[in-house]
C-alpha cells in the first residue's frame, strides 16, 4: 500500500466541511520523483489539494471539501500513472443528521398477546444508520421516582414499534416509557410517557348477531332492526361502553353513529331506518369509565329492515 487517507471525521452533518489528508510513503516515490496527488469524490475530480514533501520524504496532500452534500460517497486519492489514474487509497464518507426527537409515542395493552405494544414516529430521515430503543421502568408513583428498569425493547430494523412482554409488565402500576434514538451524530429522547398498562387496554370488539326471533316477541316494526352481540370473553369483566354505526348498503350514505350503549345491553332494537332496506352494521367498545382505547370496529353484520305494514283497511287484530 503506497498511500493512506485520514479524514477529520468519516461521518459529518450534511453540508458540513470535511478535511482529508493523503500521505504517499517514500518507498513509493519511484513512481514519480514529484508525484502529483489527485483527489476524487465519487467520479468527480476535486481541485484544491495542497501538497507538500514532509521531512521524512513522504508526500502529503491535504484537501478541504467545503460542503459535503452527498449522504454517502467515496473519497479517493490517486496518482496519474501513464494514461490512467492509480488509486492509492479510498474512504467512505457519510453525511446526515443527528436523530430528531421521536414523537407521538403511544402504547396499547393487548390482552390476547399479553403485551404492551408501543409505537412512535421516528422523525425525518437522518441518512445514517439510526437505532431506536424503547426504554422503560416500573414506578410506584407518577414516574417521578424510578423503580426497577425493564429490559430494553429493540425493534426489528426499520420498524417504529416494539412489544414489551407480560413478564416485564406490572398491571395497575405506572411505568415510565420513552424512546431513545441514536446514530453517529448524536442521541435524542422522546418525552416520557407515564402509564398503567391497563389504562391503555385495547379490547376486541363484540361479535354482532341477528337476534333470533322468539315466538312470544313481537317482530320488529318497519324501519327497525333487532340485533344482539356476543361480548369478547377475555374482556367480559371490564366495564365498557359501546357504540354502533350503520349505513345503507347501497348508495353513498356515510355512517350514522348510535351510542353510547352499555356492553351489557347485549341486544338492541335500532329504529328510524328506511323500511325494506339492507343495512351494514358494526360495533366497537372501550373500557369505561376507566381509561382505555377504542376497539377496532367489529366485522360487519348485514341486515334488512322489514317492509312498511300494508295500509289496507282490513280489521287485523294485533296481539
Amino acid at each position: 500500500e503506497c498511500g493512506h487517507i485520514s479524514v477529520s471525521a468519516p461521518i459529518v452533518h450534511l453540508g458540513d466541511p470535511i478535511t482529508a489528508s493523503c500521505i504517499i510513503k517514500q518507498n513509493c516515490s519511484h513512481l514519480d520523483p514529484e508525484p502529483q496527488i489527485l483527489w476524487r469524490l465519487g467520479a468527480e475530480l476535486q481541485p484544491g489539494g495542497r501538497q507538500q514533501r514532509l521531512s521524512d520524504g513522504t508526500q502529503e496532500s491535504i484537501i478541504t471539501l467545503p460542503h459535503l452534500n452527498h449522504t454517502q460517497a467515496f473519497l479517493s486519492c490517486a496518482l496519474n500513472w501513464g494514461n490512467s489514474l492509480q488509486i492509492l487509497d479510498q474512504v467512505e464518507l457519510r453525511a446526515g443528521y443527528p436523530p430528531a426527537i421521536p414523537h407521538n409515542l403511544s402504547c396499547l395493552m393487548n390482552l390476547t398477546t399479553s403485551s404492551l405494544i408501543c409505537q412512535w414516529e421516528p422523525g425525518p430521515e437522518t441518512h445514517l444508520p439510526t437505532s431506536f430503543t424503547l426504554k422503560s421502568f416500573k414506578s410506584r408513583g407518577n414516574c417521578q421516582t424510578q423503580g426497577d428498569s425493564i429490559l430494553d425493547c429493540v425493534p426489528k430494523d426499520g420498524q417504529s414499534h416494539c412489544s414489551i412482554p407480560r413478564k416485564h409488565l406490572l398491571l395497575y402500576q405506572n411505568m415510565g416509557i420513552w424512546v431513545q434514538a441514536e446514530n453517529a451524530l448524536g442521541t435524542s429522547m422522546s418525552p416520557q410517557l407515564c402509564l398503567d398498562p391497563m389504562d391503555v387496554v385495547k379490547l376486541e370488539p363484540p361479535m354482532l348477531r341477528t337476534m333470533d326471533p322468539s315466538p312470544e316477541a313481537a317482530p320488529p316494526q318497519a324501519g327497525c332492526l333487532q340485533l344482539s352481540w356476543e361480548p369478547w370473553q377475555p374482556g367480559l369483566h371490564i366495564n365498557q361502553k359501546c357504540e354502533l354505526r350503520h349505513k345503507p348498503q347501497r348508495g353513498e350514505a356515510s355512517w350514522a353513529l348510535v351510542g353510547p350503549l352499555p356492553l351489557e345491553a347485549l341486544q338492541y332494537e335500532l329504529c328510524g331506518l328506511l323500511p325494506a332496506t339492507a343495512y351494514t352494521l358494526q360495533i366497537r367498545c372501550i373500557r369505561w369509565p376507566l381509561p382505555g382505547h377504542w376497539s377496532d370496529w367489529s366485522p360487519s353484520l348485514e341486515l334488512r329492515t322489514t317492509e312498511r305494514a300494508p295500509t289496507h283497511h282490513h280489521h287485523h287484530h294485533h296481539h
Partner: antibody, heavy 118, light 107 residues
Amino acid sequence: EVQLLESGGGLVQPGGSLRLSCAASGFTFSLYWMGWVRQAPGKGLEWVSSISSSGGVTPYADSVKGRFTISRDNSKNTLYLQMNSLRAEDTAVYYCAKLGELGQFMDWGQGTLVTVSS
Amino acid sequence: DIQMTQSPSSLSASVGDRVTITCRASQGISSYLNWYQQKPGKAPKLLIYYASNLQNGVPSRFSGSGSGTDFTLTISSLQPEDFATYYCQQSLEYPQMFGGGTKVEIK
C-alpha cells in the same frame, strides 16, 4: 378496606330453598362483577355463579343451572344467591367474592355454611 | 369447558426450600391464570393474577410464570406461614374452573 359479609346459611332439607346475602363495603360496588364460589367439606374450590356490574350477565356452573339465581342490588351494595331444589351435594361453605377486570377473585368474604340434610 | 390440572396434589417441604407448583389447562388460556392460597378454616386469598402479576400485599417470594396451557407458581424460599393449600383458576371464559389444589405440608 374491602369487606364482604355473607349471611343466610344454615341447615335445610333436600328440595328446600335458601337465600344467601353478601353485604359489600369499602369499594364502589356498582363497578365490579361479583361472584359466588363454594367449597364442600374437605374438597376444593368450585365456582358457582357470577354477575356483571349492572346485573345483565349471569353465568352459572352446570351443576346449579336452573336451580340457583344470582342477583344484586347496587343501591344496597348487596349480592344475593337464591338456592332452590337444594341437594345433599350442595352442602358447602359459600364464599362471596369481588372480581377484578381480568376475572380474578380479588377479595373474599369469610364464607357461610350451607348444610343440606334430612 | 376448560379443565385445570394441578400437580402435585401434595408436597412436603422445609422452611427455606424452593417450591414449584404447576397448573395445566386443557386448552390455551393466554395469561388468564390466577393463583390462590387457602389456610384451614379461612377464605382463599389471591396471590397472583394474569399469570405473573403479584397481588398487592403479597410477599415477593411468590412468583408466577407461563402462558398458553402451562403455568407455574414458585415460592422462592418457603416460610412457616406458607404451609397451606394452593389453587389455580382460569378466568379466560366461563365456567371459571379451579385446579384440584396442592397441599404444601411441613416435612
